[in-house]
């Protein structure tokens, strides 16, 4: 018969390293007689036999943690007692090793330029992971503005536009590496005007383009204010390139005004705005010269006042040094010449000359003059003023000038567009439409070669007819 023997732990417990979710086993080999009762503690607290996270086998000599958690870290002891002598104990540590894990990853951030940005990156792991950051495809270097905090977070002081981009944090220890998702740092910049509109001094009826350029992130919107109110007329063209918005306000100037460009962008719930203003003033009429070809303005002379439509814009040719005075002088001279012509010819010739010297302006990017329609020119030449024209041509051939029409700035009809080819290419003379309806007999045209384009003026029932009171349509 065996002699009783007090328990002896033959294999003392050792420190066990285990990875989370893996199995960890402590072995406590005991020699004794009779067989001992073996109990286990963790941090001096008894491990219950029915705790399903553990498995105790080999008469209690083997403790297995079935799926290690990071909270299982601690000191595990086995205590053997068989009633012979005192209980014996052996202890060992469980060190839960853990691959890096990012518990609070960074998130997308929008930040205003100049402020401080913090991108969080809280980690777990054993050994404690080191944290570094990647921007785009490159490791981020720390500097006086950019630092990785003890917590792993990235702090950027005085955020600059170039800090914008995609970031990720990297947690690393001896067991592995964890990467956060890519997050975007967006740097927002208050709206700022790069190019303010310039003030202009222009002629009445001129077109002016005010240009305003602004930058910001997000790209600002530009609005225009005229004398404190939203711009009521004019057209706005906008283009955006590299976060710069370029707005051009084209105006048809009929009154002076203060035009303000307002650049606005939004940062969360708040807006930032920048403003710049320009004045548009109206110059002295005679001083204005819009461009190399000419400009459009209201007729302010006297000679053609009754012939031209009220408030209509007419073309002034800047090949003259002082277009308005020069053109008025020409028409004034012509008017005196017309005193010598017949009562039938005179009003028709006046209508022709006024509309030829002061051509109607048509809209567009640049105002352009509309010549008289060939048919109306021919009507004057071959119907209303046939005798005068013939006399003038005859005397011109013989070198004699006494007809009263030889000095007139008369258009060359053949060089004028036909309204039958393009009804929108030329100006009609309503006086002639009206007059034609009331003339029963025309002077006979005895010129050697009647024109192939002998005027086919519209009848009053057609869409071309215009009331006599409404000239220059």
């Amino acid at each position: 018969e065996k002699l009783p023997k007090a328990p002896v732990i033959t294999t003392p417990l050792e420190t066990v390293d285990a990875l989370v979710e893996e199995v960890a086993t402590f072995m406590c080999a005991v020699e004794s007689y009779p067989q001992p009762e073996i109990s286990w503690t963790r941090n001096k607290i008894l491990i219950k036999l029915f705790d399903t996270r553990y498995s105790i086998r080999e008469n209690g000599q083997l403790l297995t943690i079935l799926s290690v958690e990071d909270s299982d870290d601690g000191i595990y002891c086995c205590i053997a007692n068989n009633g012979v002598g005192g209980a014996v104990e052996s202890c060992g540590a469980l060190q839960v090793k853990m691959k890096p894990k990012i518990t609070r990853p960074p998130i997308n951030v929008k930040i205003i330029e100049g402020l401080k940005a913090v991108l969080p990156c809280t980690t777990m792991g054993n050994p404690k992971p080191s944290v570094s950051w990647i921007k785009g495809d490159n490791a981020l270097r720390e500097n006086s503005r950019i630092a990785v905090l003890e917590s792993g977070s990235l702090r950027i002081h005085n955020v600059q536009k170039e800090d914008a981009g995609q970031y990720r944090c990297v947690a690393k220890n001896s067991l592995g590496t964890a990467y956060s998702k890519l997050v975007k740092l967006e740097v927002e910049v208050f709206a700022r005007i790069l190019r303010a509109p310039e003030s202009h001094n222009v002629t009445f009826g001129s077109f002016v383009t005010l240009r305003c350029t602004a930058i910001g992130i997000p790209v600002p919107t530009i609005s225009w204010i005229e004398n404190g109110n939203a711009v009521s007329s004019g057209s706005i063209q906008e283009s955006v390139k590299d976060r710069v918005i370029d707005s051009r306000l084209q105006l048809f100037i009929t009154k002076p005004g203060l035009y303000t460009c307002i650049a606005t962008n939004k940062h969360g719930e708040k807006f930032s705005t920048a403003k710049a203003a320009a004045t548009v003033s109206i110059a002295e009429w005679s001083k204005s010269q819009k461009d190399s070809q000419g400009y459009c303005a209201q007729y302010r002379g006297e000679v053609c006042d009754a012939v031209l439509a009220k408030d209509a814009l007419v073309f002034f040719n800047t090949s003259y040094r002082d277009p308005e005075d020069a053109q008025e002088l020409l028409i004034h001279t012509a008017w005196n010449e017309l005193k010598a012509v017949s009562p039938l010819c005179r009003p028709a010739a006046e209508a022709l000359l006024c509309n030829h010297l002061f051509q109607e302006c048509s809209p567009g990017v640049v105002p352009t003059p509309m010549p008289i329609c060939r048919e109306y020119c021919l009507a004057v030449k071959e119907l209303f003023c046939a005798k005068e024209w013939q006399a003038m041509e005859g005397k011109a051939h013989r070198g004699l000038y006494r007809s009263g029409m030889h000095l007139l700035p008369v258009p060359e009809c053949s060089k004028l567009p036909s309204m039958h080819r393009d009804p929108t290419a030329c100006t009609r003379l309503p006086y002639l439409d009206y007059k034609k309806e009331n003339i029963t007999t025309f002077p006979s045209i005895t010129s050697s070669r009647p024109s192939a384009d002998i005027p086919n003026l519209p009848a009053s029932t057609s869409s071309f007819a215009v009331s006599p009171a409404y000239s220059m349509t």
């Epitope: 009826g205 007329s233 057209s235 048809f252 070809q293 459009c296 439509a309 408030d311 209509a312 814009l313 109607e360 302006c361 048509s362 809209p363 567009g364 990017v365 640049v366 352009t368 010549p371 053949s414 060089k415 004028l416 567009p417 036909s418 080819r421 393009d422 009804p423 929108t424 290419a425 869409s463 220059m472 349509t473």
Partner: antibody, heavy 115, light 113 residues
Framework: EVQLVESGGGLVQPGGSLSLSCVAS????????MNWVRQAPGKGLEWLSV???????YYADSVKGRFTISRDNVKNTLYLQLNNLKPEDTALYYC?????????WGQGTQVTVSS | DIVMTQSPSSVTASAGERVTINCRSS????????????LNWYQQRLGQSPRLLIY???ARESGVPDRFSGSGSTTNFTLTISSFQPEDAAVYYC?????????FGSGTRLEIK
């Protein structure tokens, strides 16, 4: 009678060039504004360009920098030079007379841009 | 740029019926100097080149039947066919010519019932 006859269309590869011509007759060509308008298969009309009597031109944004309109008043011919062509330029190209309305239209010339 | 919006996109009509097509511009096309609206209407029959019907919003092009009329001002315009005829089946386009680029509307297809 006004006649506008376009030519020069054809099949061209993306990035290629083409020159369209439009011979005008029946009117004094030099006195009138001329336009190009196109129509993609099964689609609507798209105004491309206008040239005035002084050869000042304006273009639609879609073709600015790639297409060039010009005129030869001696030959009574309107041109459209098409560069850096894209598949979306495939269309019937019309030559049109008119200043502020497109008054007389040609029959069109087909341009196909395909690889 | 001035954007042209046409409605409806298609319409069917019986012979003799009155038809209206609408067109809206994103900016005014009324030129204050001469009080003209720079708005045109075109007809394009299947397989044919377009044809000018109306210019300056209400002026009928020569040779266009008087059942076609144009109206409206500033930004809202209408083409009316007072008594639809089978030969009027076509696509109709509006176009602004106030300033380049001279954009067209997307078109209205008019079909016979």
């Amino acid at each position: 009678e006004v006649q506008l006859v376009e030519s020069g269309g054809g099949l061209v590869q993306p990035g290629g060039s083409l020159s369209l011509s439009c011979v005008a007759s029946g009117f004094t060509f030099s006195l009138y504004y001329m336009n190009w308008v196109r129509q993609a298969p099964g689609k609507g009309l798209e105004w491309l360009s206008v040239i005035d009597t002084h050869s000042i031109a304006y273009y639609a944004d879609s073709v600015k920098g790639r297409f060039t309109i010009s005129r030869d008043n001696v030959k009574n011919t309107l041109y459209l030079q098409l560069n850096n062509l894209k598949p979306e330029d495939t269309a019937l190209y019309y030559c049109v007379l008119g200043r502020t309305a497109l008054v007389r239209w040609g029959q069109g010339t087909q341009v196909t841009v395909s690889s | 740029d001035i954007v042209m919006t046409q409605s409806p996109s298609s319409v069917t009509a019986s012979a003799g019926e009155r038809v209206t097509i609408n067109c809206r511009s994103s900016q005014s096309v009324l030129y204050s100097s001469n009080q003209k609206n720079y708005l045109n209407w075109y007809q394009q029959r299947l397989g044919q080149s377009p044809r000018l019907l109306i210019y300056w919003a209400s002026a009928r092009e020569s040779g266009v039947p008087d059942r076609f009329s144009g109206s409206g001002s500033t930004t809202n315009f209408t083409l009316t066919i007072s008594s639809f005829q089978p030969e009027d089946a076509a696509v109709y386009y509006c176009q602004q010519s106030y300033k380049p680029p001279y954009g067209f509307g997307s078109g209205t297809r008019l079909e016979i019932k």
